[in-house]
């Protein structure tokens, strides 16, 4: 239904608190360099305006679109060109081009300092003084660093944050209460960010059809008892929600997500038997819970997939009559039977099936041609299964840090031109897949591993797009989203790479490394490891292990020494010499 005032409609639907939070997220994701205070001022102005429209929908400007209202606010910011350069040119355009222009200027890797968590006492003091401002800062800091973060989900994480602070700030030992809990939220939020970025990439690069296919596969796995019509309705709604969020329409996105959650809870009987616990929760928790609800029990009497999609003489006729519906049905039927497959794998199988029908249905005897299609799926299924086994075995043998290092060596060899910080970030993230997925039951490993790796590799592609340096990476990133992970896995040592010359200063360390937190120490060591591989791309695992063990021993010795500075300055050059010899 059309509303006289869109802004009044959204304010009424969402309520003041969520409305303000979403507007703050929107502004922070568009203008990532502005301070919290600048954005908070704009949010208050927009909220006051929304209230006037609620009071009188016919008031001046209340009929304007949200893009027009928000865009006008952003374009009125003083010193826009000085702070944002060519983004200011967006303000010369009319809607909808202006909003598209803002979207194109979102920076996936903004040059902002890492978000440092204040110490417990300070955090609790400012939280108690003004919880609203404190949470506003959280939304602002996360949103500007993650310009595609799923806005309604960020409100959920802010709510989690709030609950943790409320609980822990009342404890005697605030630090030990806060640290593990906030670390848990941070980890989940970071994973949520890369997953959502992948969805937006899918939408931006391949359109709604590609995202809808992803949604059909995912929903069919989770709700195997829902019929195809129900899955299609949910996938269509979910596509709309994600399109809105990826497009910066955060108020509509959050509103439609709430509607979708409501619909699911009102129609549990035709969707899944597992929704009740989620549906008993308040809005943000409910929507979050539904998004990661456990798979329903698969129907016991499902016929073999071959009956309708291989053995039936009508396959090509059905395909001709409604290609997308027939392929959608195939994806639905295959996915509901395979909660143990990754969505990426299911989409590759559907693509293979489509290609087979395209080829076979044009032949004089199609059934003879497509009759072997399911057998042709086998190598596509085996490849990720082997990947999971090999990598989980390696993780179990080396632990997370050692596994990250193995991945770092592998990926530096595949794409040595990529900057060391990007390689280290990617390897650390890829390496976390072990901790995240390899401990799960066998039937959950493959979907966890592959879909997580795909999301991380999407980030690698986004960073590489800004400054393309590796033909290997460009090749894998320019293909379809579902083929990226197999493409990266298949890459070998880049033979075109001219090794970096050995620079002693790259491997020179000082006593300040001793006081760094463990994570920062690991990053320093991993930076050195990547640089070693860039110097000697064909170094054996044994050679690299020797050097890294020597390096670890050197750090341990010097950090325990009475005179650390002297130890570093005398033993450091010896270490460099030994490294050069070991790799000669």
């Amino acid at each position: 239904e059309a509303h006289k005032s869109e802004i009044a409609h959204r304010y009424n639907d969402l309520g003041e608190q969520h409305f303000k939070g979403l507007v703050l997220i929107a502004f922070s994701q568009y203008l990532q360099k502005c301070s919290y205070d600048e954005h908070a001022k704009l949010v208050q102005e927009v909220t006051d305006f929304a209230k006037t429209c609620v009071a009188d929908e016919s008031a001046a400007n209340c009929d304007k679109s949200l893009h027009t209202l928000f865009g006008d606010k952003l374009c009125a910011i003083p010193n826009l060109r000085e702070n944002y350069g060519e983004l200011a040119d967006c303000c010369t355009k009319q809607e909808p081009e202006r909003n598209e222009c803002f979207l194109q200027h979102k920076d996936d890797n903004p040059s902002l300092p890492p978000f440092e968590r204040p110490e417990a006492e300070a955090m609790c003091t400012s939280f108690k003084e003004n919880p609203t401002t404190f949470m506003g800062h959280y939304l602002h800091e996360v949103a500007r660093r993650h310009p595609y973060f799923y806005a309604p989900e960020l409100l959920y994480y802010a709510e989690q944050y709030n609950e943790i602070l409320t609980q822990c700030c009342a404890e005697a030992d605030k630090e030990s209460c806060l640290t593990p809990k906030l670390d848990g939220v941070k980890e989940k939020a970071l994973v949520s960010s890369v997953r959502q970025r992948m969805k937006c990439s899918s939408m931006q690069k391949f359109g709604e059809r590609a995202f809808k296919a992803w949604a059909v596969a995912r929903l069919s796995q989770t709700f195997p008892n829902a019929d195809f019509a129900e899955i299609t309705k949910l996938a269509t709604d979910l596509t709309k929600v994600n399109k809105e969020c990826c497009h910066g329409d955060l108020l509509e996105c959050a509103d439609d997500r709430a509607e979708l959650a409501k619909y699911m809870c009102e129609n549990q009987a035709t969707i899944s038997s597992k929704l009740q616990t989620c549906c008993d929760k308040p809005l943000l928790k409910k929507a979050h819970c539904l998004s990661e609800v456990e798979h329903d029990t698969m129907p016991a009497d499902l016929p073999a997939i071959a009956a309708d999609f291989v053995e039936d003489q009508e396959v090509c006729k059905n395909y001709a009559e409604a290609k997308d519906v027939f392929l959608g049905t195939f994806l639905y039927e295959y996915s509901r039977r395979h909660p143990d497959y990754s969505v990426s794998l299911l989409l590759r199988l559907a693509k293979k099936y489509e290609a087979t029908l395209e080829k076979c249905c044009a032949e004089a005897n199609p059934p003879a041609c497509y009759g072997t299609v399911l057998a042709e799926f086998q190598p596509l299924v085996e490849e990720p299964k082997n990947l999971v086994k090999t990598n989980c075995d390696l993780y179990e043998k080396l632990g997370e840090y050692g596994f990250q290092n193995a991945i770092l060596v592998r990926y530096t060899q595949k794409a040595p031109q990529v900057s060391t910080p990007t390689l280290v970030e990617a390897a650390r993230n890829l390496g976390r897949v072990g901790t995240k997925c390899c401990t799960l039951p066998e039937d959950q490993r493959l979907p966890c591993v592959e879909d997580y790796l795909s999301a991380i590799l999407n980030r690698v592609c986004l960073l590489h797009e800004k400054t393309p340096v590796s033909e290997h990476v460009t090749k894998c990133c320019s293909g379809s989203l579902v083929e990226r992970r197999p493409c990266f896995s298949a890459l070998t040592v880049d033979e075109t790479y001219v090794p970096k010359e050995f620079k002693a200063e790259t491997f020179t360390f000082h006593s300040d490394i001793c006081t760094l937190p463990e994570k920062e120490k690991q990053i320093k060591k991993q930076t050195a490891l990547a640089e070693l591989v860039k110097h000697k791309p064909k170094a054996t695992a044994e050679q690299l292990k020797t050097v890294m063990d020597d390096f670890a021993q050197f750090l341990d010795t010097c950090c325990k020494a009475a005179d650390k500075d002297t130890c570093f300055s005398t033993e450091g050059p010896n270490l460099v010499t030994r490294c050069k010899d070991a790799l000669a």
Epitope: Q313, E358, C361, A362, E363, P366
Partner: nanobody
Framework: KVQLVESGGGLVQPGGSLRLSCAAS????????MTWVRQAPGKGLEWVSS????????LYADSVRGRFTISRDNSKNTLYLQMNSLRPEDTAVYYC????????SSQGTLVTVSS
């Protein structure tokens, strides 16, 4: 909406000829192999002939090989069946179908071979 409309049937004497046509719409005709099937009075469906999307490959049932010729004109979205040396046992309703389908969804065209 996929539509297949057969025409060209009629009464013909044994040894005579007929040319059946099938006008197709609602799908990418050239991307699909096509088939002629027939159903004699009181009998089940019988496959007659098939042709690939490009028209380069053709297949025939033993009972019609050497007498019937399947062809297509992709520019006109039309399938043909040239039937020569017709016999009384060729009497049937003839249907065109998509791919290897043996269950028609069209009206068909009646061919009667009788003296």
């Amino acid at each position: 909406k996929v539509q297949l409309v057969e025409s060209g049937g009629g009464l013909v004497q044994p040894g005579g000829s007929l040319r059946l046509s099938c006008a197709a719409s609602g799908f990418t005709f050239s991307s699909f192999g096509m088939t002629w099937v027939r159903q004699a009075p009181g009998k089940g469906l019988e496959w007659v002939s098939s042709i690939s999307g490009s028209g380069s490959d053709t297949l025939y049932a033993d009972s019609v090989r050497g007498r019937f010729t399947i062809s297509r004109d992709n520019s006109k979205n039309t399938l043909y069946l040239q039937m020569n040396s017709l016999r009384p046992e060729d009497t049937a309703v003839y249907y065109c179908t998509i791919g290897g389908s043996l269950s028609p969804s069209s009206q068909g065209t009646l061919v009667t071979v009788s003296s």
